[in-house]
């Protein structure tokens, strides 16, 4: 999906009003020195591409983020503010339902959510180049 035509300000508002707080709740009890961000993004569409990938694509050691509250709210925001996004996700959602597993918060998941927080920070304040 190409995130170029999303309403970035509306997504930012959704993130700041609820998603950010859910991410903080998920990370509670984790030391702020624990994880170094290794995933970066250069502009808002790129940030959303990376955010979608980390939030919804299962990875080795962390298969369950898509069922977390922040993930559901992220999906809702993208569905509302990115034209045509929901349609592209129908097949992906059906596939996810088939492999649904028990929620487990692993260290790998915590690291992944730390990466997500960093990606959202760059989404909220895109490009260290002149805007």
């Amino acid at each position: 999906y190409d995130f170029t035509n999303c309403d970035f300000e509306k997504i930012k508002a959704a993130y700041l009003s609820t998603i950010s707080k859910d991410l903080i709740t998920y990370m509670s009890g984790t030391k702020s020195t624990e994880f170094n961000n290794t995933v970066s993004c250069s502009n808002r569409p790129h940030c959303l591409t990376e955010i979608q990938s980390l939030t919804f694509n299962p990875t080795a050691g962390c298969a369950s983020l898509a069922k977390e509250m922040f993930a559901m709210k992220t999906k809702a925001a993208l569905a509302i503010w990115c034209p045509g996004y929901s349609e592209t996700q129908i097949n992906a959602t059906q596939a996810m339902k088939k492999r649904r597993k028990r929620k487990v918060t692993t260290n790998k998941c915590l690291e992944q959510v730390s990466q997500l927080q960093g990606l959202w920070r760059r989404f909220n304040r895109p490009l260290l180049k002149q805007q």
Partner: antibody, heavy 119, light 107 residues
Framework: EVQLVQSGAEVKKPGSSVKVSCKAS????????IEWVRQAPGQGLEWIGV????????NYNENFKGRATLTADKSTSTAYMELSSLRSEDTAVYYC????????????WGQGTTVTVSS | DIVMTQSPDSLAVSLGERATINCKAS??????VTWYQQKPGQSPKLLIY???NHYTGVPDRFSGSGSGTDFTFTISSLQAEDVAVYYC?????????FGQGTKLEIK
């Protein structure tokens, strides 16, 4: 506990340079932008620029372009602001600050470094 | 550059009364406005981000509102420890810019 500790006061001659350091602790240094802001005596706040310690990307206020240089050393979790061609109007308190967890504000500030430019 | 203009420059309010500071941007900054408090000899402190969100530990008597170009910062019931200079800042476009500050005193 997040802390930003800045280097001590400096007195400089016009035309010289100054390098202010900002040592971060209590968080993953490369994950958060470091901002630099200055405040002339009795005046308001002026943004100098920002650096991403993770990759070295910078953005400068045009008013300081060519005179200010922002760098970061990940091995010591220290950010630096160097200002060259100093003039008396550069006399100010210089602050480093960290972006907050959402990327929309500065949540932790250094104690400030007073730079006095005088002949 | 986006110019942030605060009004008034100084304000005297009685203890327990409401204090209101306005901040006007020279062009739309969406909701990307932050408010800081600075006491004499201290570094600025973050109070409100993204117009109306309280930073951790900031008392409820502080609040912010507005969007676009017009923003308001309010202290609902002034306490002695609120005497300070207050700054608005826009985070919408580089270079980031601050208002000139509003000095709040007790009447």
């Amino acid at each position: 506990e997040v802390q930003l500790v800045q280097s001590g006061a400096e007195v400089k001659k016009p035309g010289s340079s100054v390098k202010v350091s900002c040592k971060a602790s209590g968080y993953a240094f490369s994950n958060y932008l470091i901002e630099w802001v200055r405040q002339a005596p009795g005046q308001g706040l002026e943004w100098i620029g920002v650096i991403d310690p993770g990759n070295g990307d910078t953005n400068y206020n045009e008013n300081f372009k060519g005179r200010a240089t922002l760098t970061a050393d990940k091995s010591t979790s220290t950010a630096y602001m160097e200002l060259s061609s100093l003039r008396s109007e550069d006399t100010a308190v210089y602050y480093c600050a960290r972006e907050d967890n959402t990327g929309t504000a500065f949540d932790y500030w250094g104690q400030g470094t007073t730079v006095t430019v005088s002949s | 550059d986006i110019v942030m203009t605060q009004s008034p420059d100084s304000l005297a309010v009685s203890l327990g009364e409401r204090a209101t500071i306005n901040c006007k941007a020279s062009q739309s900054v969406s909701s990307d406005v932050t408010w800081y408090q600075q006491k004499p000899g201290q570094s600025p402190k973050l109070l409100i981000y993204y117009v109306s969100n309280h930073y951790t530990g900031v008392p409820d008597r502080f609040s912010g509102s507005g969007s676009g170009t017009d923003f308001t910062f309010t202290i609902s019931s002034l306490q002695a420890e609120d005497v300070a200079v207050y700054y608005c800042q826009q985070h919408h476009r580089f270079p980031l810019t601050f208002g000139q500050g509003t000095k709040l005193e007790i009447k």
